[in-house]
Amino acid sequence: AFGISGVQKYTRALHDSSITGISPITEYLASLSTYNDQSITFALEDESYEIYVEDLKKDEKKDKVLLSYYESQHPSNESGDGVDGKMLMVTLSPTKDFWLHANNKEHSVELHKCEKPLPDQAFFVLHNMHSNCVSFECKTDPGVFIGVKDNHLALIKVDSSENLCTENILFKLSET
């Protein structure tokens, strides 16, 4: 598994400060785990990165992800004046130059090396829940969220709003 060291946290801060031509509001280095406290880990296999959802052994170090937060206009903005209808989007990067991407055709979540500006597939609308968990909705496919399926991350369609709190799309962010 790999992650970002404390030193890298500062040396790569803001990724040149411009991903979509706008600067992030903030960046946050955190470990990502599921609602049921399984860790999201990243491993290099056959020259590509795999994403796993697994129980860590005691004292095993958690992988870290750099979350960059951006403000964006919400598409259903009725007022049209730019004041209303803002949303918070994040990109997730577990190591330099690699970002989580939504592959909507395959319903999969993948790690891709990419150039800036990042494609829309790398952006996720952030939702925070009463449980203080978060969920990540695809910018490119509203109603589709990063979720857990068969010990992997996958894209999960939330058919109705009643399922927004379903455990398999809820994640915890932790500094430790």
């Epitope: 919400h74 259903s76 927004l164």
Partner: antibody, heavy 122, light 107 residues
């Protein structure tokens, strides 16, 4: 233009219940949680809780868990706060407020109702 | 719960003064802090969100800074209409919590 319009002032006796309404317009009602905040005379702001209009999921501040009930009527884009077993300390202005960000509480409250004064007196 | 502590609880200042109000969070809230202005008999108005982002229509004499646990609201040159009570509020985690307020009065 986004507006949150609340019901009028109420005077209640101790032990009674009160139901305050908040009618939203100018935005997609189900996209943003509706929050309720109260302010006793000369005091600060205190969060009561909020409700997700999409699924009715509620959160109550510990102080209000047993006595507050948050509901919504999607057909009229109206949120309701009901507070039961009223006591004199519940005398306050009650506000509804909407989050700044779609789906997230991180940006604070951008739109507020005008407030509803609830007076509890015997 | 995250406790929000504002200081001072009140201050007296003159028109043209630079005024600074601080807010301390009991745990890390990143930049997820908002500042509000409230005048007597009125509802609160959002001034600053995400610690430093000025809400639309708010005069540029208002500014916010900070991240983690310590935050500051600054009014660079106090105007007559700025005499009011100011509140900070964290949006990072439930329950959402406010500071106790800072009343800015005329000296």
């Amino acid at each position: 233009e986004v507006q949150l319009v609340q019901s009028g002032a109420e005077v209640k006796k101790p032990g009674a219940s009160v139901k305050v309404s908040c009618k939203a317009s100018g935005y997609t009602f189900s996209d943003y949680n509706m929050n309720w905040v109260r302010q006793a005379p000369g005091q600060g702001l205190e969060s009561i809780g909020d409700i997700n209009p999409k699924n009715g999921d509620t959160f109550y501040n510990q102080n209000f868990k047993d006595r507050a009930t948050l509901t919504i009527d999607k057909s009229t884009s109206t949120a309701y706060l009901e507070l039961s077993s009223l006591r004199s300390e519940d005398t306050a202005v009650y506000y509804c407020a909407r989050h700044y960000y779609y789906g997230s509480s991180y940006g604070g409250f951008v739109y507020w109702g005008q407030g509803t004064l609830v007076t509890v007196s015997s | 719960d995250i406790q929000m502590t504002q200081s001072p609880s009140s201050l007296s200042a003159s028109v043209g003064d630079r005024v600074t109000i601080t807010c301390h969070a009991s745990q890390n809230i990143n930049v997820w802090l908002s500042w509000y202005q409230q005048k007597p008999g009125k509802n609160p108005k959002l001034l600053i969100y995400a610690a430093s982002k000025l809400h639309t229509g708010v005069p540029s004499r208002f500014s916010g800074s900070g991240s983690g646990t310590d935050f500051t609201l600054t009014i660079s040159s106090l105007q007559p209409e700025d005499f009011a009570t100011y509140y900070c509020q964290q949006g990072q985690s439930y329950p959402l919590t406010f500071g106790q307020g800072t009343k800015v009065e005329i000296k």
